[in-house]
Interface confidence: medium
């Protein structure tokens, strides 16, 4: 028996359902009574779901997995993983045994988009050219860790005096706080871009300082 899976990682958004595709080619006369199907975590061999002795043995993985029972006899051994969590990320092995056996691994990559950044300025009043200011760009609830880029109003990258911290919350999602310290010119726009490297999603935030008072551009 030959097992086939997608070579590309399956990308799934947090809290959505993902399908890990796996198929085999049944011989003529194949019946489900002959099938021994096991999904397991590749690294630890932790059991995830199984179909043995002619029936679905159910989820062994937080009761969030299911097979496609009507399609099994056609050789579709795919696994549905519901309400995907960050901790589900990793490699899953599909193991099929009929008379002989074969297995193949498929990777699950979990992702969550970052929120539109919020911008704060410190100090935020009585600003004068030549003052040192701290601009903080905050974006929330993304996964995996973000890439953060700062630019000035002319699109020139700002790389000096930038400190970025990323903290995972209890769900494993990251909150990003990036701090830029700059000396104010007469006026200027400072923008931050938070990029999710898996989703290729960019979230933008900017602040414009025009003497007095400072303004934030309207929401996009």
């Amino acid at each position: 028996v030959e097992v086939q899976v997608s070579e590309d990682p399956v990308v799934a958004l947090v809290d959505t359902d993902a399908t890990l595709r796996c198929s085999f080619s049944p011989e003529p006369g194949f019946s489900l009574a002959q099938l021994n199907l096991i999904w397991q975590l590749t690294d630890t061999k932790q059991l995830v779901h199984s179909f043995t002795e002619g029936r679905d043995q159910g989820s062994a993985y937080s009761n969030r997995t299911a097979l496609f029972p009507d399609l099994l006899v056609q050789g579709n051994a795919s696994l549905r993983l519901q309400r995907v969590r960050v901790t589900d990320e990793g490699s899953y092995t599909c193991f099929v045994s009929i008379q002989d056996f074969d297995s193949a691994a498929v990777s699950l990559q979990v992702a969550a988009p970052y929120s539109k950044p919020s911008m704060t300025l410190e100090p935020n009043k009585d600003l004068r050219p030549g003052n040192m200011v701290t601009i903080t760009c905050s974006s929330y609830q993304g996964y995996p860790e973000a890439e953060v880029f700062w630019k000035d109003g002319q699109g020139v990258p700002l790389t000096g005096n930038v400190t970025t911290s990323q903290m995972a919350n209890e769900r494993g999602l990251f909150d990003v706080h990036s701090v830029l310290r700059v000396v104010l010119g007469a006026n200027g726009t400072y923008s931050c871009l938070v990029r999710n490297p898996v989703l290729q999603q960019d979230a933008h935030g900017s602040v414009t300082i025009t003497g007095q008072p400072l303004t934030f551009p309207p929401e996009a």
Epitope: I38, L47, S50, G58, F95, S97, S103
Partner: antibody, heavy 117, light 112 residues
Framework: QVQLQQPGAELVKPGASVKLSCKAS????????MHWVKQRPGQGLEWIGL????????NYNEMFKNKATLTVDRSSSTAYVQLSSLTSEDSAVYFC??????????WGQGTTLTVSS | DVVMTQTPLSLPVSLGDQASISCRSS???????????LRWYLQKPGQSPKLLIY???NRFSGVPDRFSGSGSGTDFTLKITRVEAEDLGVYFC?????????FGGGTKLEIK
């Protein structure tokens, strides 16, 4: 007929590790899951986990995840449980039991593990 | 984890009497595949447990018909009609619907 052979007893010092065996005969080893169960003297039964001999797939009771490691040697039709960092709490009879994923019909006679210095 | 509560703890009987043991689970034992994985075992001193009843009411091969199981959901009963000397020992109920699989605390069937 189905037989699961286990050594009668093991004596081990605290802090050490031990690997208990269960040799299967009378059936196709890879067609049954193998379960392990702990029974302390005069107490109830605790399920440690299971392993599938063909795929090596395992499912542990969280309570034993850092204590027990299940393995198989298909060539000798033998299942093993390795117990680490032993304390007196690990002194017990350890049974292997063969069956499906959701049941276990055939039990070994059990190995009495004594942890003592 | 699913807690399995057995009553009574000890059951003194006379040979030839009927015995009844109750087992209650802390949540339903109906599996997603529709079956109920509740089993009864008998363990005699110095021996491993022997399977009597599987899936609530099915007698395992070689088990005499004086043993019967019944129940559904969370409440289950093992009945032994006409208790014989060889029936004495500790009876355990067990569930394998939910991981981790769990056992009742046991009921000791002894001569009155």
């Amino acid at each position: 007929q189905v037989q699961l052979q286990q050594p009668g007893a093991e004596l081990v010092k605290p802090g050490a590790s031990v690997k208990l065996s269960c040799k299967a005969s009378g059936y196709t080893f890879s067609s049954y899951w193998m379960h392990w169960v702990k029974q302390r003297p005069g107490q109830g039964l605790e399920w440690i986990g299971l392993i599938h001999p063909d795929s090596g797939s395992t499912n542990y009771n969280e309570m034993f995840k850092n204590k027990a490691t299940l393995t198989v040697d298909r060539s000798s039709s033998t299942a093993y449980v390795q117990l680490s960092s032993l304390t007196s709490e690990d002194s017990a009879v350890y049974f292997c039991a063969g069956g499906g994923r959701l049941y276990f019909d055939y039990w070994g006679q059990g190995t009495t593990l004594t942890v003592s210095s | 984890d699913v807690v399995m509560t057995q009553t009574p703890l000890s059951l003194p009987v006379s040979l030839g009497d009927q015995a009844s043991i109750s087992c209650r689970s802390s949540q339903s034992l109906v599996h997603s595949n529709g079956d109920t994985y509740l089993r009864w075992y008998l363990q005699k001193p110095g021996q491993s447990p022997k399977l009597l009843i599987y899936k609530v009411s099915n007698r395992f091969s070689g088990v005499p018909d004086r043993f019967s199981g019944s129940g559904s959901g969370t409440d289950f009963t093992l009945k032994i009609t006409r208790v014989e000397a060889e029936d004495l020992g500790v009876y355990f109920c067990s569930q394998s619907t939910h991981v981790p699989y769990t056992f009742g605390g046991g009921t000791k069937l002894e001569i009155k």
